[in-house]
């Protein structure tokens, strides 16, 4: 089981392991997303993403789930009892994360360009919004982030 | 080899209750989601539930929604699905599958079991 | 609710191939899966992640998935190909398995 954004393979990541624990911290601590008709990973985000590209996007996007919605949202976990559940996920995201090699080649400029471009949009969506509204959405959309990578996961 | 062997169907009246059961072997239960998925007389397949590995989450279709309940018993290798309420339009072959690994993939199935609800 | 269109037959002349679409909103950002029933038997995966075939399952089927449309192709389609096929994605804002309303392939 791996993950192959592009050049750039994954491995020791079982992803529905990830789904679950996504669901249980959902499910025991979001609350209420009330901006229903704004979306944080919009499809042009992650709309025909190519497999070189992939590898660029998917360490921007996940490095600041690390950094910026998880470091964040670990506050709110500390009131339930579902810290396993997000550490599972957390965890998981450091080693996708810490395997993402992009190629820093100057040929590649173009591509790593575009996905930067994309990230752009998401990173400039969530700065929109209140923080606390912004964590909560950014946490909400794990779901879309996971649906989209699992197009790169092979068995 | 995989096998998933649906029973527990028949037929029951309007109102009533039923709980199929699929019994797995051949691979490690424990570790794969399950489906329920069923198919009426000449139509198409339709989703009904989905369990996680050890059950902490359950989904279900909106049209068995609060009638229908999923579970497993890991250390028995079943899955279950308890269908309350049952209406003449949950007439159908009632399948359960396997996740493939990935998630959302349905890569093995059972040969189903028929249910009738009639009056 | 997310829903997935599939035309209701395709036909093929032997050899030939066979394409059989799958339209949903944006479902090139979703895993598609493409299942195939014979009549009387249970359903078998035959892609699953948009274009991966499971073992066993022969090459001629292959499939991909961009924009609003996923696409299973079967090159050299043979007799024993004629079967219905339903495509399937995850819908994430309702947390539901969603299948297509099916295909049935003809093999002329």
């Known amino acids: 089981q791996e993950f192959r954004f592009g050049s750039c393979q994954v491995t020791g990541v079982v992803l529905p392991e990830l789904w679950e624990a996504f669901w249980t911290v959902k499910n025991t601590v979001q609350t209420q997303d009330d901006i229903t008709s704004i979306r944080l990973l919009k499809p042009q985000v992650l709309r025909n993403v190519s497999g070189a590209e992939s590898c660029y996007l998917a360490h921007s996007l996940l490095k600041f789930y690390l950094n910026t919605v998880f470091k964040n949202y670990h506050s709110k976990i500390a009131k339930f009892k579902v810290l396993r559940s997000f550490s599972t996920l957390a965890n998981n995201f450091i080693v996708i994360m810490s395997q993402l090699q992009p190629s820093k080649d100057n040929s590649m400029l173009p591509i790593s360009e575009s996905a930067h471009q994309r990230f752009l949009l998401f990173r400039r969506a969530f700065k929109q919004l209140d923080t606390e509204v912004a964590l909560v959405k950014a946490f909400g959309e794990v779901d879309i982030l996971l649906t989209w990578m699992q197009k790169f996961y092979h068995l | 080899e995989l096998q998933l062997v649906e029973s527990g169907g028949g037929s029951v009246q309007p109102g009533g209750s039923l709980r199929l059961s699929c019994a797995a072997s051949?691979?490690?239960?424990?570790?794969?989601?399950m489906y329920w998925v069923r198919q009426a007389p000449g139509k198409g397949l339709e989703w009904l539930s989905l369990i996680t590995t050890d059950g902490g989450s359950t989904f279900y279709a909106d049209s068995v929604k609060g009638r229908f309940t999923i579970s497993r018993d890991n250390a028995k290798n079943t899955l279950y699905l308890q269908m309350n309420s049952l209406k003449s339009e949950d007439t159908a072959v009632y399948y359960c599958?396997?996740?493939?690994?990935?998630?959302?993939?349905?890569?093995?199935w059972g040969q189903g079991t028929q249910v009738t609800v009639s009056a | 609710s997310y829903e997935l269109t599939q035309s209701p037959s395709v036909s093929v002349a032997q050899r030939q191939t066979a394409k059989i679409t799958c339209g949903g909103d944006?479902?090139?950002?979703?895993?598609a899966q493409w299942y195939q029933q014979k009549p009387g038997q249970a359903p078998v995966m035959v892609i699953y992640?948009?274009?991966r075939r499971p073992s066993g399952i022969p090459e001629r089927f292959s499939g991909s998935n961009s924009g609003n449309t996923a696409t299973l192709t079967i090159s050299g389609a043979q007799a024993e190909d004629e079967a219905d096929y339903y495509c399937q994605a995850w819908d994430s804002s309702a947390n539901a398995v969603v299948f297509g309303g099916g295909t049935h392939l003809t093999v002329l």
């Open positions: 944006n479902i090139g950002s979703k895993s």
């Open positions: 051949g691979f490690t239960f424990s570790n794969y989601w």
């Open positions: 599958a396997k996740d493939l690994g990935s998630g959302f993939s349905l890569g093995s």
């Open positions: 992640s948009d274009s």
